[in-house]
């Protein structure tokens, strides 16, 4: 489907508003440190150029690829070398190497100030004064902090962001209306970013086949009534969409995502009975709704899997002649029967099945060799079931904050070399699995918990990749995508770790802790907990609990004191001394 001018084609397909928004997202995800005004200028220049190409597709440079056009534009930034250092060397390369170079320099943890939410009245004034700039700024700030955010989905978030301000800035109590909506968008946005980051990591680190396998399993669970050929078509199209977005081809990605939503809605009868409501919505809502749609009911009377995958005389022939199709069918058939399994478990089962066939098919009696293959699945299924049961019991016993602390201690002992902010962030997120998933019935716990943990552990993997400090993290992150969680679960205390030198400054606190939100105060305490474990990795749960209880009491006491700062200074010294004694430091 060749077009004389790719930029004109995408401009016409997407419309000016979406075109501009997507170019802004693309530029902000590449040049994460550039000021907003610079990006707006570049976007306007690209948009004006696109309009000339719409008017005349044969005009000069209109035949150039989007990577060439966008890359040339990014390389006009005057401060590229001083702001980005070696990323400026990308500009000496030709496409496609130049785009690959820009992609490699995307920073998952950019050194950007925390986004501070202004007063509601200030935000509403800014929104009314210049709605377009206000919304562009939202796209820019999210995109630069989340360089892999799923661009068409960010357009959906921006639409909801606009709707929140439109509604709430007219409300009697603006804050009561707006703040919960903004909190919800923030939390959903972080979750969406992390989920997409896993998709991109899957494609970039483990290849297209790994992503396709994930997609076959997930779509088969979601659309169990759809035929294998239909699921395969959706997987191929979905893979193209995510490959494009992860590769920075945001215009193509958004365009293809819209086409996929259109196809799904036109063919919902052969896909799922749950799509009706989604398909009545406008484009952005429709695509989001389809992505989140609940699993359809399983067809009644599905035959046993053994007939085609164990008992058939053609098992080995089918495997050898077309592994992708045969193993894809196995995964499809298993997944549609098991909405109660996590996707990663289904992928482990498929891998076990594949390994067994590879081992058995050349044997003298292949059938005898692989006849008991399904028995090998039992321990693989029981392992996450037992782990989730244990951890949900612990969560129900402790509550979220203390459950997070238990995980902080557990993971700091496993990988103490990892930076404290990363351990705090990742363990807090791991701990959220409790409130997110433990409330579900048994049949929904595993897909909720283990697939969520895959997303969180991927955050650890991408943050660690930027500054690798632990061979154990590298090993768990790179060896197998589907075995990351079991790999981390299996890690014991790192006996090779040399405890960190004690530094009193780390445990010195000031009155400013009293004005922090409950969440920020928790983070401060959890940071101290990680540091404690790094100093004393062999400390028992009881010792750590005693110190943390003393610490909580100390903060509470000093925050009630008249002279808070003096209290923190004097009581802090006592606390440090008592803690050192309690831990034998």
């Amino acid at each position: 489907d060749a077009h004389k001018s790719e930029v004109a084609h995408r401009f016409k397909d997407l419309g000016e508003e979406n075109f501009k928004a997507l170019v802004l997202i693309a530029f902000a995800q590449y040049l994460q440190q550039c000021p907003f005004e610079d990006h707006v200028k570049l976007v306007n220049e690209v948009t004006e150029f696109a309009k000339t190409c719409v008017a005349d597709e044969s005009a000069e440079n209109c035949d150039k690829s989007l990577h060439t056009l966008f890359g040339d534009k990014l390389c006009t930034v005057a401060t590229l070398r001083e702001t980005y250092g070696e990323m400026a060397d990308c500009c000496a390369k030709q496409e496609p190497e130049r785009n690959e170079c820009f992609l490699q320099h995307k920073d998952d943890n950019p050194n950007l100030p925390r986004l501070v939410r202004p007063e509601v009245d200030v935000m509403c004034t800014a929104f009314h004064d210049n709605e377009e700039t206000f919304l562009k700024k939202y796209l820019y700030e999210i995109a630069r902090r989340h360089p892999y955010f799923y661009a068409p989905e960010l357009l959906f978030f921006a639409k909801r962001y606009k709707a929140a301000f439109t509604e709430c800035c007219q409300a009697a109590d603006k804050a009561a209306c707006l703040l919960p909506k903004l909190d919800e968008l923030r939390d959903e946005g972080k979750a969406s970013s992390a989920k997409q980051r896993l998709k991109c990591a899957s494609l970039q680190k483990f290849g297209e086949r790994a992503f396709k396998a994930w997609a076959v399993a997930r779509l088969s669970q979601r659309f169990p009534k759809a035929e294998f050929a239909e699921v395969s078509k959706l997987v191929t199209d979905l893979t193209k969409v995510h490959t494009e977005c992860c590769h920075g081809d945001l215009l193509e990605c958004a365009d293809d995502r819209a086409d996929l939503a259109k196809y799904i809605c036109e063919n919902q009868d052969s896909i799922s009975s749950k799509l009706k409501e989604c398909c009545e919505k406008p484009l952005l809502e429709k695509s989001h709704c389809i992505a989140e749609v609940e699993n359809d009911e399983m067809p009644a009377d599905l035959p046993s899997l053994a007939a085609d995958f164990v008992e058939s005389k053609d098992v080995c022939k089918n495997y050898a002649e077309a592994k992708d199709v045969f193993l894809g069918m196995f995964l499809y058939e298993y997944a549609r029967r098991h909405p109660d399994y996590s996707v990663v478990l289904l992928l482990r089962l498929a891998k076990t099945y594949e390994t067994t066939l590879e081992k058995c098919c050349a044997a003298a009696d292949p059938h005898e060799c692989y006849a008991k293959v399904f028995d090998e699945f039992k321990p693989l299924v029981e392992e996450p079931q037992n782990l989730i049961k244990q951890n949900c019991e612990l969560f129900e016993q402790l509550g979220e904050y203390k459950f997070q602390n238990a995980l902080l201690v557990r993971y700091t002992k496993k990988v103490p070399q990892v930076s404290t902010p990363t351990l705090v962030e990742v363990s807090r997120n791991l701990g959220k699995v409790g409130s997110k998933c433990c409330k579900h019935p048994e049949a929904k716990r595993m897909p909720c918990a283990e697939d969520y943990l895959s997303v969180v552990l991927n955050q650890l993997c991408v943050l660690h990749e930027k500054t690798p400090v632990s061979d154990r993290v590298t090993k768990c992150c790179t060896e197998s995508l589907v075995n990351r969680r079991p790999c981390f679960s299996a890690l014991e205390v790192d006996e090779t770790y040399v405890p960190k030198e004690f530094n009193a400054e780390t445990f010195t606190f000031h009155a400013d802790i009293c004005t922090l939100s409950e969440k920020e105060r928790q983070i401060k305490k959890q940071t101290a907990l990680v540091e404690l474990v790094k100093h004393k990795p062999k400390a028992t749960k009881e010792q750590l609990k005693a110190v943390m209880d003393d610490f909580a009491a100390f903060v509470e006491k000093c925050c009630k004191a008249d002279d808070k700062e003096t209290c923190f200074a004097e009581e802090g010294k006592k606390l440090v001394a008592a803690s050192q004694a309690a831990l034998g430091l």
């Epitope: 050898a320 592994k323 590879e358 081992k359 050349a362």
Partner: antibody, heavy 119, light 110 residues
Framework: EVQLLESGGGLVQPGGSLRLSCAVS????????INWVRQAPGKCLEWIGI?????TTFYATWAKGRFTISRDSTTVYLQMNCLRAEDTAVYYC???????????????WGQGTLVTVSS | DIVMTQSPSSVSASVGDRVTITCQSS???????LSWYQQKPGKAPKLLIY???KLTSGVPSRFKGSGSGTDFTLTISSLQPEDFATYYC???????????FGCGTKVEIK
């Protein structure tokens, strides 16, 4: 000592047929997969096909129809029909590493037998 | 069509040198089904590495295989006199019928 020994090579006219043998000693052939691989003078290695322990065979796409692999208790055969000049090569038999069925891991090789197709 | 490209086609090196040979596959190989063979004149090939990075028993640790998907590398960290030979990569794919070898890299004495 485990050995694979090819025989049956020689000069053959275009359009002719030839049957190569691979005698296996030192192991029970009924437990292993055996491949045929060829190498034209100064050229690449080229996989021809495989016979599994069960007797099931698979061939390279280009080899289907003209080449047939079979076996008895101690020998694996490669029947070659409608031979052409471009089939001139050293033909090797090789064992697939035990524990694999479709992977290109061949740990034991014969010394090869030269087939020359020429008028 | 399956294409397996080895580069360089030949390399001249001295004893003690580090030598790197690459193998590019299109499409990607199945499940890291990638092997490396060494062949000396008049002899049969010898399996060095399987599953892209696993050393066959008895192969010296100076041989190292790496890579995944479409791009693979064989590195000889410190070339020894007995390492002068031709090296081939072999790839397995979704269909066994597509089993393919690269066309070799000849490592010669400088």
């Amino acid at each position: 000592e485990v050995q694979l020994l090819e025989s049956g090579g020689g000069l053959v006219q275009p359009g002719g047929s030839l049957r190569l043998s691979c005698a296996v000693s030192g192991i029970d052939l009924s437990n292993y997969a055996i491949n045929w691989v060829r190498q034209a003078p100064g050229k690449c290695l080229e996989w021809i096909g495989i016979i599994w322990a069960s007797g099931t065979t698979f061939y390279a796409t280009w080899a289907k129809g003209r080449f047939t692999i079979s076996r008895d208790s101690t020998t694996v055969y490669l029947q070659m029909n409608c031979l052409r000049a471009e089939d001139t090569a050293v033909y090797y038999c090789a064992r697939t590493v035990p524990g694999y069925s479709t992977a290109p891991y061949f740990d034991l090789w014969g010394q090869g037998t030269l087939v020359t197709v020429s008028s | 069509d399956i294409v397996m490209t080895q580069s360089p086609s030949s390399v001249s090196a001295s004893v003690g040198d580090r030598v790197t040979i690459t193998c590019q596959s299109s499409p990607s190989v199945w499940s890291n089904f990638l092997s490396w063979y060494q062949q000396k004149p008049g002899k049969a090939p010898k399996l060095l590495i399987y599953e892209a990075s696993k050393l066959t028993s008895g192969v010296p640790s100076r041989f190292k295989g790496s890579g995944s998907g479409t791009d693979f590398t064989l590195t000889i960290s410190s070339l020894q006199p007995e390492d002068f030979a031709t090296y081939y990569c072999g790839g397995g794919y979704s269909s066994i019928s597509d089993t393919t070898f690269g066309c070799g890299t000849k490592v010669e004495i400088k």
